[in-house]
């Protein structure tokens, strides 16, 4: 059976990213076209054929290139991905005998968490704040020496596509916490990172 094999990719913001399509069980295509899927109709990005070589549409001139030149295996590379590049891309193999055969590969852009952890004493209580900003939205947990400590969490979405999750640990008897370690755990894309803070009495 003639088919196109693709793989979705997740890459970090402002780094290169590549999407690959492989035409299986068919002869070389006559032409390969890459399109970005859009709400109304797909947008042509780049084509490759024997006669014409690589033809990049003006909107993508300095953004992408075909880095695997083939009529059975084709790879496009984004030099420096932005949030606008997130989405799904179609590769169309125009073949002799089978017509147009397409595959879809999706690109997800992530931003590594930026974490801040600090504390503040007031007269009768201690607030420890852990804030993590990432894409997709991170999750924040606490690891404290004893149970029963309340926390509140606020989530804020930013125009740049990242999300900040801020969790505040409210400790009512701050004296008991002095010298002890509090751990803020940030979960992002399946990875948990610990951020440790030892409370010292100012």
């Amino acid at each position: 059976q003639v088919q196109v094999v693709t793989q979705d990719e997740r890459e970090q913001l402002y780094t290169p990213a590549s999407l690959k399509c492989s035409l299986q069980n068919a002869q070389e295509a006559l032409i390969v076209t890459w399109q970005k899927k859009k709400a109304v109709s797909p947008e042509n990005m780049v084509t490759f054929s024997e006669n014409h070589g690589v033809v990049i549409q003006p909107a993508y001139k300095d953004k992408i290139n075909i880095t695997q030149l083939g009529l059975q295996n084709s790879t496009i590379t984004f030099w420096n991905i932005t949030l606008e590049d997130e989405g799904c891309y179609m590769c169309l193999f125009n073949t002799f005998g089978f017509g147009k055969i397409s595959g879809t590969a999706c690109l997800t852009v992530y931003v590594q968490p930026i974490v801040s952890l600090h504390y503040k004493f007031s007269e009768d209580h201690l607030n420890i704040t852990c804030s993590a900003t990432a894409r997709p939205a991170p999750m924040v947990f606490w690891k404290v020496p004893r149970s029963g400590i309340e926390n509140s969490t606020v989530t804020l979405s930013h125009p740049n596509g990242t999300t900040s999750v801020t969790s505040i640990l409210h400790i009512k008897d701050p004296k008991n916490q002095v010298g002890k370690e509090v751990i803020c755990q940030v979960l992002h894309l399946g990875t948990v990172t610990d951020f440790k803070q030892t409370v010292n009495k100012g």
Partner: antibody
Framework: EVKLVESGGGLVKPGGSLKLSCAAS????????MSWVRQTPEKRLEWVAS???????YYLDSVKGRFTISRDIARNILYLQMSSLRSEDTAMYYC?????????????WGQGTTLTVSS | DIVLTQSPASLAVSLGQRATISCRAS??????????MHWYQQKPGQPPKLLIY???NLESGIPARFSGSGSRTDFTLTINPVEADDVATYYC?????????FGGGTKLEIK
């Protein structure tokens, strides 16, 4: 530095055979389309045959069935096997690299090797 | 086959002046918003050398005195100003359709 060096030309009788070679260096040979282009004694340039990066071959109608283009990727050599040669095949034969990023124009050429078909 | 007709067959230009060479295709060589017409320079005893690709793109290392323009069927190579080193034969070539074809050449001389 990209270098293409042709060899194998010579004087052949009509109906005879000859094999041209082109040794390539300075680039990833398998990643480019390679072609043979000839120049007649009247200085007209004529594309003869090409082999794509994927190995697909293309020929000028007048040489189809008589000429075979091939390559040895391990040794970076392009070949043109010519048989049933005719007087009109007399020309300087150039090996040229087709660049996929510049509309498959020929961005590098060898110095050429001469084929003379005469009785 | 696409026939490329170059004119003039030869021209003589004074040093420092402009040289204009025309190439007319028997049918359009445009696809995907690009013109698949290329220009080469050939000096005696040497192979052709790529000057301009896809109608107007200057090949790396070629002086900016050389420029290309045109679309569909009508293309022009301009050399301005002409230098003594530019004495050569110039060829246009299309890669829009197989077989790839070349023009008959234009011989440039210094007046």
């Amino acid at each position: 530095e990209v270098k293409l060096v042709e060899s194998g030309g010579g004087l052949v009788k009509p109906g005879g055979s000859l094999k041209l070679s082109c040794a390539a260096s300075g680039f990833t040979f398998s990643g480019f389309a390679m072609s043979w282009v000839r120049q007649t004694p009247e200085k007209r340039l004529e594309w003869v045959a090409s082999i794509s990066s994927g190995g697909t071959t293309y020929y000028l109608d007048s040489v189809k069935g008589r000429f075979t283009i091939s390559r040895d990727i391990a040794r970076n050599i392009l070949y043109l096997q010519m048989s049933s040669l005719r007087s009109e095949d007399t020309a300087m034969y150039y090996c040229a690299r087709g660049n996929y990023y510049s509309g498959t124009s020929y961005d590098y050429w060898g110095q050429g090797t001469t084929l003379t078909v005469s009785s | 086959d696409i026939v490329l007709t170059q004119s003039p067959a030869s021209l003589a230009v004074s040093l420092g002046q402009r040289a204009t060479i025309s190439c007319r295709a028997s049918e359009s060589v445009d696809s995907y918003g690009n013109s698949f017409m290329h220009w080469y320079q050939q000096k005696p005893g040497q192979p052709p050398k790529l000057l301009i690709y896809r109608a107007s793109n200057l090949e790396s290392g070629i002086p900016a005195r050389f420029s290309g323009s045109g679309s569909r069927t009508d293309f022009t190579l301009t050399i301005n100003p002409v230098e003594a080193d530019d004495v050569a034969t110039y060829y246009c070539q299309q890669s829009n359709e197989d077989p790839r074809t070349f023009g008959g050449g234009t011989k440039l001389e210094i007046k």
